[in-house]
C-alpha cells in the first residue's frame, strides 16, 4: 500500500436546503483506471462511512440508489455533493481515495472538510 496526497477544502457551509458540495483532489502517481472514493464523517471522535463509489476513469461516479451522495469526476478531481443534511449532521467529512487498478494500490486520506449545516428558520405562522 502506497500513500497519496488528497486535498479538500477546510470549511464549507451547506446551503439552506441542506446541500454541500466540495472537491476532493488526489495526486495520482500513475495512470489509474479504477478509483474508489469514500466519504467518512468524524464527529465526537467517532468515524462513520457516509457513502462510497467505485468508478472507471472517464466514467460517472455511481453511488448506491439510496445514497445521500452524488458526484462527478474530472481527471484527478472528484466533485462530491452531499444532500439531505441537517444541523445535527455538522461535522468533519473526510475524503478517502483508493487507486484500485492497475497495481500498485495507492491510498490517500484528506484532512477533512468541516461542513456546517444550519437548519432553516421555521416560517412564522400566518393567518389566512
Amino acid at each position: 500500500c502506497k500513500a497519496m496526497h488528497v486535498a479538500q477544502p477546510a470549511v464549507v457551509l451547506a446551503s439552506s436546503r441542506g446541500i454541500a458540495s466540495f472537491v476532493c483532489e488526489y495526486a495520482s502517481p500513475g495512470k489509474a483506471t479504477e478509483v474508489r472514493v469514500t466519504v467518512l464523517r468524524q464527529a465526537d471522535s467517532q468515524v462513520t462511512e457516509v457513502c462510497a463509489a467505485t468508478y472507471m476513469m472517464g466514467n460517472e461516479l455511481t453511488f448506491l440508489d439510496d445514497s445521500i451522495c452524488t458526484g462527478t469526476s474530472s481527471g484527478n478531481q472528484v466533485n462530491l455533493t452531499i444532500q439531505g443534511l441537517r444541523a445535527m449532521d455538522t461535522g468533519l467529512y473526510i475524503c478517502k481515495v483508493e487507486l484500485m487498478y492497475p497495481p500498485p494500490y495507492y491510498l490517500g486520506i484528506g484532512n477533512g472538510t468541516q461542513i456546517y449545516v444550519i437548519d432553516p428558520e421555521p416560517c412564522p405562522d400566518s393567518d389566512f
Epitope: 470549511v11 458540495s21 468533519l92
Partner: antibody
Framework: QVQLVQSGAEVKKPGASVKVSCKAS????????ISWVRQAPGQGLEWMGW????????NYAQKLQGRVTMTTDTSTNTAYMELRSLRSDDTAVYYC??????????WGQGTLVTVSS | EIVLTQSPGTLSLSPGERATLSCRAS???????LAWYQQKPGQAPRLLIY???SRATGIPDRFSGSGSGTDFTLTISRLEPEDFAVYYC?????????FGQGTKVEIK
C-alpha cells in the same frame, strides 16, 4: 504568516451604510470561512455571522438579518461586511476572523465604526 | 439560541495563583465546538483553546481547557503578569454561534 488586515475607522450618520473590508494573506482563502464579530464600547463580543469563501454561502445572526450582507472577492482574497440603516447602537469595533475546521484564528486588528449625528 | 454564562464576572488573583474560569451552556454543546479567547484592552481577541481542550498554536501549557455537555472550564495553572485580561468562551456547534459575557481576571 496567516494575516487578516481590515480597513480603517469610519464615522457614519444614522441611516447610512458602512462596508468594512478584510484582506487575507498567507493561506488558501477559498478553503476557509470568514466570520464577523463586533464589540460595542466597554461590552462583550457579539457574533454577527459568517461566510464560506468556498461557496459564498452565508449564515447571519437573526437580529441583523436584512441589514447585513457578507461577501467575498476571491480574486483579491478579501471579505466584506456591509451594514445598512446604521443606528447609534451599531457603534462598535468590528472584527473579522478566519473560520477553520473547528477553530477561529487569526483575528483582524478591528475597525472602529462610529455612528453619530 | 444557546446562552453561555461565564462565572465569576471578575476574578481577583495574584501572580502565581491558579485561575479557574467557568462557562455554562443553556443546552448541551458538542465539545468539538467550544473555544476560549483572551482579550487585552485595545487588542483583538486571541484564540487560546478550541475543541474544549486543544491548545492553539503558541499558547503556553499553563492554559488548559476541559469539560463537556453544558459545563466547561478554562484553567490557568500559574498566573503570569501578562495573563490579566478578559476571557470569553464561545460555542459554534449550533447556530447562532454565541459568546459568553466574559470573565475579567484582575490583579489583586
Amino acid at each position: 504568516q496567516v494575516q487578516l488586515v481590515q480597513s480603517g475607522a469610519e464615522v457614519k450618520k444614522p441611516g447610512a451604510s458602512v462596508k468594512v473590508s478584510c484582506k487575507a494573506s498567507g493561506y488558501t482563502f477559498t478553503s476557509y470561512g470568514i466570520s464577523w464579530v463586533r464589540q460595542a464600547p466597554g461590552q462583550g463580543l457579539e457574533w454577527m455571522g459568517w461566510i464560506s469563501a468556498y461557496n459564498g454561502n452565508t449564515n447571519y445572526a437573526q437580529k441583523l438579518q436584512g441589514r447585513v450582507t457578507m461577501t467575498t472577492d476571491t480574486s483579491t482574497n478579501t471579505a466584506y461586511m456591509e451594514l445598512r440603516s446604521l443606528r447609534s447602537d451599531d457603534t462598535a469595533v468590528y472584527y473579522c476572523v478566519r473560520v477553520g475546521a473547528n477553530w477561529f484564528d487569526p483575528w483582524g486588528q478591528g475597525t472602529l465604526v462610529t455612528v453619530s449625528s | 439560541e444557546i446562552v453561555l454564562t461565564q462565572s465569576p464576572g471578575t476574578l481577583s488573583l495574584s501572580p502565581g495563583e491558579r485561575a479557574t474560569l467557568s462557562c455554562r451552556a443553556s443546552q448541551s454543546v458538542s465539545s468539538s465546538y467550544l473555544a476560549w479567547y483572551q482579550q487585552k484592552p485595545g487588542q483583538a481577541p486571541r484564540l487560546l483553546i478550541y475543541g474544549a481542550s486543544s491548545r492553539a498554536t503558541g499558547i503556553p501549557d499553563r492554559f488548559s481547557g476541559s469539560g463537556s455537555g453544558t459545563d466547561f472550564t478554562l484553567t490557568i495553572s500559574r498566573l503570569e503578569p501578562e495573563d490579566f485580561a478578559v476571557y470569553y468562551c464561545q460555542q459554534y456547534g449550533s447556530s447562532p454561534w454565541t459568546f459568553g459575557q466574559g470573565t475579567k481576571v484582575e490583579i489583586k
